[in-house]
Interface confidence: medium
Amino acid sequence: KLTIESTPFNVAEGKEVLLLVHNLPQHLFGYSWYKGERVDGNRQIIGYVIGTQQATPGPAYSGREIIYPNASLLIQNIIQNDTGFYTLHVIKSDLVNEEATGQFRVYPELPKPSISSNNSKPVEDKDAVAFTCEPETQDATYLWWVNNQSLPVSPRLQLSNGNRTLTLFNVTRNDTASYKCETQNPVSARRSDSVILNVLYGPDAPTISPLNTSYRSGENLNLSCHAASNPPAQYSWFVNGTFQQSTQELFIPNITVNNSGSYTCQAHNSDTGLNRTTVTTITVYAEPPKPFITSNNSNPVEDEDAVALTCEPEIQNTTYLWWVNNQSLPVSPRLQLSNDNRTLTLLSVTRNDVGPYECGIQNELSVDHSDPVILNVLYGPDDPTISPSYTYYRPGVNLSLSCHAASNPPAQYSWLIDGNIQQHTQELFISNITEKNSGLYTCQANNSASGHSRTTVKTITVSAELPKPSISSNNSKPVEDKDAVAFTCEPEAQNTTYLWWVNGQSLPVSPRLQLSNGNRTLTLFNVTRNDARAYVCGIQNSVSANRSDPVTLDVLYGPDTPIISPPDSSYLSGANLNLSCHSASNPSPQYSWRINGIPQQHTQVLFIAKITPNNNGTYACFVSNLATGRNNSIVKSITVSA
């Protein structure tokens, strides 16, 4: 069937439209286009004869129409009058006629709208505002946007005049927003610039800050007032009812008890004509004395002496407070407070008790803190540490050993080699060492105040070659998927290359394997049962290369989900039931059985002779590994038929 399609159907003024013909018959003589829904010679636009390829304009031809050989009609520079129906009249070669009608609509391109308002400065809770979208346009739809969102549902918002007018009743400060209107028709949509609604409000009840109402004599009083208001409020201060100044802030330096009283802030909005006030009562107290701490022992010895700290001066009916390290007192059996909290006693002091300590006196207004006091606890020396940690040195290098022991006052150090005193210094330096410098190096640390001394002995070997290495481990029985293991290749030596092998192969590339400490330490993160292998470390220098004995990692794992065998679940009455349970586990797990939830025996094998249908039910094997602390189980249903 012959049809006409209008592309587009809705056409903007000044644009073009194509009347596209579908299913045009074969063997045509020609065709004509007419304005309207019927063939009317007075309204012919154009005719076309196929044989001559001749187009002939008709009375309704405007010069904007173009006809195509496929009968389609293009109309350019569309005007409003072009709206309507168009009829195609087709004359076939057998002179039989056929007709089809199409149509389109013409709409104007909309201008950019603007918003007019009946009240530029509405007052909160009093005024209404009507926004109107200009200009008024026929066949246009009007939309409104608030802060780029569609209109909220509110009984105070009303659309009228075909949505062209938006009225806000009883405006509030929250209506202060960006308003836009939009006009739409089938061919265009335009938005206005935004209009900001300026709602006058306030002042609200002012707030006075800071909130504290108690001050000490000699302090500065600095009060600030603020009230929500549009336009911003004008402020006035009154003290005990007497006007002071018209400012937002009130400042009185070096106050005395006489400055106690009622302080009023008044906020005024000149546009709304409203006033609001807030009153605060300020109390000024006389200054109490600053406390200080006295001690009965200025140099206590660790683990021997007690110290009593006393907060001075003694004042009747006063609360005393204490702080250690800027924290309130911890609960400790070594800390004791006297009945009035004025004396703090530390029993058997340790080096961690140095403080600082502060005491405080509490009055009506605040807490007065003492200056901090630090205890000089005498301690140590602890066992000295000798660094570096190398035990092997090659001939010809310089030996530089340093000794350190935690001590107060700092320790005095002495060095001995093979029992013979060398020097009284913290560091020992020997240049260009030979194998004769091998021996026992002793560092002795002495605390002159406590009279204590401690020693550490280190064996130093001077040799160009290295010994056979050995592997030390930080965890001999790691748990699978939980623990990490660090293997360290001993000894630690200068100018040495450290190498590792696993099961005789060089280390595999794995994110769980990490070398550190100059390759001397091999760490396995999140060990798995597959890590239970032989680990060997090697050391290499210019004259020696050797491997350690293998260390096999014993990874604790499991128990995995057990397996009950045989897999059969159906038995004949009178048969023997012999179930075996197995679970991969290291060490081997403990086994137990339950039948229908009732505990049975703690064995790996469950045997029941000459079973009957009474033995039907669920058979559960439970496994537990005491080393990993993990459990597992499996349930099997057994059916016995008569």
Epitope: P395, G396, K468, V543
Partner: antibody, heavy 120, light 105 residues
Framework: QVKLEQSGAEVVKPGASVKLSCKAS????????MHWLRQGPGQRLEWIGW????????EYAPKFQGKATFTTDTSANTAYLGLSSLRPEDTAVYYC?????????????WGQGTLVTVSS | NVLTQSPSSMSVSVGDRVTIACSAS?????MHWLQQKPGKSPKLLIY???NLASGVPSRFSGSGSGTDYSLTISSVQPEDAATYYC?????????FGGGTKLEIK
């Protein structure tokens, strides 16, 4: 398979110089140290020193300082011993020797030796 | 560090037990032993005082400490005829003993 192949015998006049080679196969010389030793007729073994082919570090026995020079060509996997100002008492079999890091120890792989005869 | 071996030579029968001594002029933590057959390169026999090198028969053993070390062959075999050297690697220069020549009667 680890193997050290040394260059052939040399006969030189006193005061002359000579350069001996030691080609390694079965391992990369950069992974190890190369030692040189010598053994005079009916004499004990003498250690000349070592070279680290990776960085060129060397250590010489005091007796051979100025007499011996160690070099390597890592691309050819070869170590060289240069001997200068030769005297009749330098007549000896010169050995190259090393121990791979896979060990267990150094001095477990030896070249077949190069006889150097110093004679006028 | 001078190494002195004794004896300098010895002649023994197959099956005999043989001990070769090596004395160091100053203390060393380890001693090593090499075997050299006539016309051949030396071969590592024992390292770090008592460890057998790869492929060395168990009849060979080493012991000692400080300045005195020894190599023992528990039951001499014909193929053991060779010169045996001790070696120290603790201090530079590395040094060798004068050698002990072992002959089989």
């Amino acid at each position: 398979q680890v193997k050290l192949e040394q260059s052939g015998a040399e006969v030189v006049k006193p005061g002359a110089s000579v350069k001996l080679s030691c080609k390694a196969s079965g391992f990369n010389i950069k992974d190890s140290y190369m030692h040189w030793l010598r053994q005079g007729p009916g004499q004990r073994l003498e250690w000349i020193g070592w070279i680290d082919p990776e960085n060129g570090d060397t250590e010489y026995a005091p007796k051979f300082q100025g007499k011996a020079t160690f070099t390597t060509d890592t691309s050819a996997n070869t170590a060289y011993l240069g001997l200068s100002s030769l005297r009749p008492e330098d007549t000896a079999v010169y050995y190259c020797n090393e121990g791979t890091p896979t060990g267990p120890y150094y001095f477990d792989y030896w070249g077949q030796g190069t006889l150097v005869t110093v004679s006028s | 560090n001078v190494l002195t071996q004794s004896p300098s030579s010895m002649s023994v029968s197959v099956g005999d037990r043989v001990t070769i001594a090596c004395s160091a002029s100053s203390s060393v933590p380890y001693m090593h032993w090499l075997q050299q057959k006539p016309g051949k390169s030396p071969k590592l026999l024992i390292y770090l005082t008592s460890n057998l090198a790869s492929g060395v028969p168990s009849r060979f053993s080493g012991s000692g400490s400080g300045t005195d070390y020894s190599l023992t062959i528990s039951s001499v075999q014909p193929e053991d005829a060779a010169t045996y050297y001790c070696q120290q690697r603790s201090s530079y220069p590395l040094t060798f003993g004068g050698g002990t020549k072992l002959e089989i009667k």
